[in-house]
């Protein structure tokens, strides 16, 4: 049978050849004509056999980390017969490890984030080194971790590579640390190889600082002309924290006048003092308010850092502005009866200079030929007014300071022209009526209605009558319907076209004004030769033809 021991070759041997061992058949007594052969991957290249003795040599430098074992086959032939002395056999050459690989941190770069003020023992990160050497071969791949840089704030567990906090750190003093970890193989014994890695440890912010005003007193000014909502200035607090932990809210702590407000600009973290109510220099020319600032987000466990909010005092000076004249009222409404004579009194407007110097005021009316105003604000008419032409006048009255003509105010003045009964009622339209020659008595000839250009305080009420002469002629009569209409009826039977082709009836219409006015209105009635049906349509048609120059038979 085959005789051999386990074959080992140390890796990284620098000699040109290294004796691995000897393959031998127990039938080989040294005098036999036995020839040994080596087959398989690595035979003839990595490993050479002395075919006469069976001695195997490694002729290449081997790297266990590249290949840790070779599986080869051995043959032995008796050259006298050419036959195999032993069955072909497989054997293994193991490459034995030497400590030729340093530990390597394969996952670098390492970066960790840990909250500031974390207590001792807080886990930061675990770093792991790999050693390509054989973990089962002595201590070649047994690693020990140590801290080369990072004391006294950090420590590393020697066997696990777990980095922990060993001292509290304040991000506001230093926000990141470079820690250098060394991994040594051979559990740190002499001849150990080492590798290092750097770990960037960043401290994340916790809200351990409250915002504090940069100034204990701010002086701001506001123009008395500033509208509400005007930003009159900014105040600023600083917070050593960052991000969300530095977000702050400003608010008013004291403002008896309730004139100001503070809003927070969350982009710049400034407090903006806002005018909540308009100020008046002449009324109050300075204010004092107190503002406070707090963080927007505060965790319960960090409340100890935020017990008293920082405050500041804000002095606000009101700046005087030359203000335009101020009318007593925002608008005026005056009334005047129509038909009053030119120069009649309409009303008085009044404006004053709100400033302390109290400039005299001049008044004017913009684009009006009907009214006039004097320096006392008295408005008079320049013409007689007719309500039926214009019942309202919209005036623009301007007040100008005498000392500063650029200071102008305008207000609307509405003048209502009041009605007087100066128009009698009249027909609402022109009426042309027709009656048949054969018309009977009491036949309705026309319904009439009236209009009155005057304004009625209540309802207009019109009264209809025939004139005295027409009443006496008695060919027609009128009935007042009591609804501002009346009907004209025949007062006899039969009419003669030849004798009296047209009747002109005078109708009196009176209104219910005080005093009452009456008008006389003429109604024209044509006599027609009607057909048997008594229709005046043909009569009207004939009239139409005649009016157009045609003659009808």
């Amino acid at each position: 049978g085959w005789v051999w021991n386990q074959f080992f070759v140390p890796e990284e041997m620098n000699t040109t050849s290294h004796h691995v061992g000897r393959l031998r058949s127990d039938l080989d007594n040294g005098n036999n004509s036995f020839q040994y052969k080596l087959l398989g991957a690595g035979a003839g290249s990595t490993f050479i056999i002395d075919e006469r003795t069976g001695d195997i040599y490694a002729i290449e430098k081997l790297d266990r980390e590249e290949r840790s074992l070779y599986i080869l086959r051995a043959q032995v032939i008796d050259i006298t017969t050419g036959r195999a002395v032993e069955p072909e056999s497989e054997f293994v050459i193991k490459v034995s490890d030497i400590n030729d690989n340093e530990p390597k941190f394969l996952d670098e770069p390492y970066e960790a984030i840990v909250p500031e003020m974390s207590p001792e023992g807080t886990l930061v990160i675990q770093v792991t080194a790999s050693d390509a050497d054989d973990p089962s071969s002595g201590n070649n791949a047994r690693l020990l971790y140590s801290l080369l840089q990072g004391q006294p704030y950090f420590s590393v567990e020697p066997t696990t590579g777990v980095i922990r906090i060993s001292s509290k750190m304040d991000r506001e003093l230093q926000d990141e640390y470079w820690v250098i970890i060394q991994a040594k193989d051979m559990i740190g014994q002499p001849g150990a190889l080492s590798g290092t890695t750097s770990v960037l440890i960043k401290l994340s912010d916790v809200n351990d600082n409250k915002p504090i005003f940069k100034e204990s007193l701010y002086r701001l000014t506001v123009s008395e002309s500033a509208p509400t909502g005007t930003s009159i200035g900014t105040i600023m607090a600083y917070d050593n924290d960052i991000g969300e932990n530095a977000e702050m809210d400003y608010s008013i702590e004291e403002d008896d006048s309730q004139t100001f407000d503070i809003i927070t600009n969350h982009e710049t973290q400034e407090g903006i003092v806002i005018l909540k109510k308009k100020v008046n220099f002449e009324h109050q020319n300075h204010y004092g308010i107190r503002a406070k600032v707090k963080n927007h987000h505060v965790d319960k466990q960090l409340m100890k850092y935020h017990t008293e909010a920082s405050t500041t005092f804000i002095k606000i000076q009101v700046e005087d502005v030359d203000e335009p004249p101020l009318f007593l009222l925002p608008y005026y409404i005056f009334e005047i009866f129509e038909e009053t004579p030119q120069g009649s009194f309409v009303g008085v407007v009044s404006a004053t200079d709100p400033d302390n110097r109290k400039s005299p005021i001049r008044y004017s009316i913009t684009r009006s030929k009907v009214f006039n105003i004097d320096d006392n604000g008295t408005i008079t008419t320049t013409n007689s007014l007719d309500r039926e032409i214009s019942a309202w006048y919209n005036l623009s009255i301007t007040a100008t300071e005498k000392y500063n003509i650029e200071q102008i105010s305008s207000i609307p003045v509405y003048v209502q022209v009041l009605n007087i009964n100066d128009h009698a009622p009249e027909f609402s339209q022109y009426y042309e009526s027709y009656v048949c020659e054969n018309a009977g008595s009491g036949q309705v000839i026309q319904t009439i209605s009236a209009v009155d250009r005057d304004e009625s305080i209540e309802e207009h009420h019109f009264y209809f009558n025939l004139s005295v002469e027409d009443t006496n002629s008695s060919s027609f009569t009128i009935i007042d319907n009591q609804d501002n209409t009346a009907v004209i009826l025949t007062n006899r039977t039969g009419f003669n076209l030849q004798e009296e082709p047209i009747f002109y009836i005078s109708i009196l219409i009176a209104d219910n004004g005080i005093p009452s006015l009456t008008s006389t209105n003429t109604l024209t009635i044509h006599v027609c030769d009607c057909d048997d049906s008594g229709s005046t349509q043909t009569c009207q048609y004939q009239e139409l033809m005649l009016s157009m120059g045609f003659k009808t038979e």
């Epitope: 040109t16 004509s33 050479i48 001695d55 050259i79 006298t80």
Partner: antibody, heavy 120, light 108 residues
Framework: QVQLQESGPGLVKPSETLSLTCTVS????????WSWIRQPPGKGLEWIGY???????NYNPSLKSRVTMSVDTSKNQFSLKLSSVTAADTAVYYC??????????????WGQGTLVTVSS | EIVLTQSPGTLSLSPGERATLSCRAS???????LAWYQQKPGQAPRLLIF???SRATGIPDRFSGSGSGTDFTLTISRLEPEDFAVYHC?????????FGGGTKVEIK
Amino acid sequence: QVQLQESGPGLVKPSETLSLTCTVSGGSISGYYWSWIRQPPGKGLEWIGYIYYIGSTNYNPSLKSRVTMSVDTSKNQFSLKLSSVTAADTAVYYCARDGSSGWYRWFDPWGQGTLVTVSS
Amino acid sequence: EIVLTQSPGTLSLSPGERATLSCRASQSVSSSYLAWYQQKPGQAPRLLIFGASSRATGIPDRFSGSGSGTDFTLTISRLEPEDFAVYHCQQYGNSPLTFGGGTKVEIK
């Protein structure tokens, strides 16, 4: 063609170590077996042993205890050391090429030989 | 080890004559692994025959080898003046390699 040249001291004192070197030219030492053969004056040839280019050796049992062979492929040389010499070791020492891998072969070519005398 | 015995120890012949040299092994030589060398005074041996019967490169055909097992022969068909020398046989079928004592061919 391949040529071999022995070199070393021609005189060695008894009990000392005889050292010879064979330099191969005109070809590589790698891939071959290299032998040392000696011939005492007026006598026959005696095979001392061989060295394979990888360093494997096989010595004549009659001399095994005193012989050491080595090879330096980078210099294309191989060497012989024979320790504890006596007058009986006086001979012409030849180096010769045996075959390449495989069983033993004849010797060809040979060096021209160097005479080593053991004498005090 | 295999002991090779060469005979005769000396062979006296004239040029042009045939020379027959014998080499006998103490045990069979594997696969006829036997070689013949020629050695002239002051020179290294020179290979003539290997494998019992194969001529080495450049060797004249008047030299021939034969035999197997334990008996081997070197024949020089017509001796030339330059052929007068010592002839050695060597077996390489077993370790250690051994040589015969040599046969001297001299001019008669």
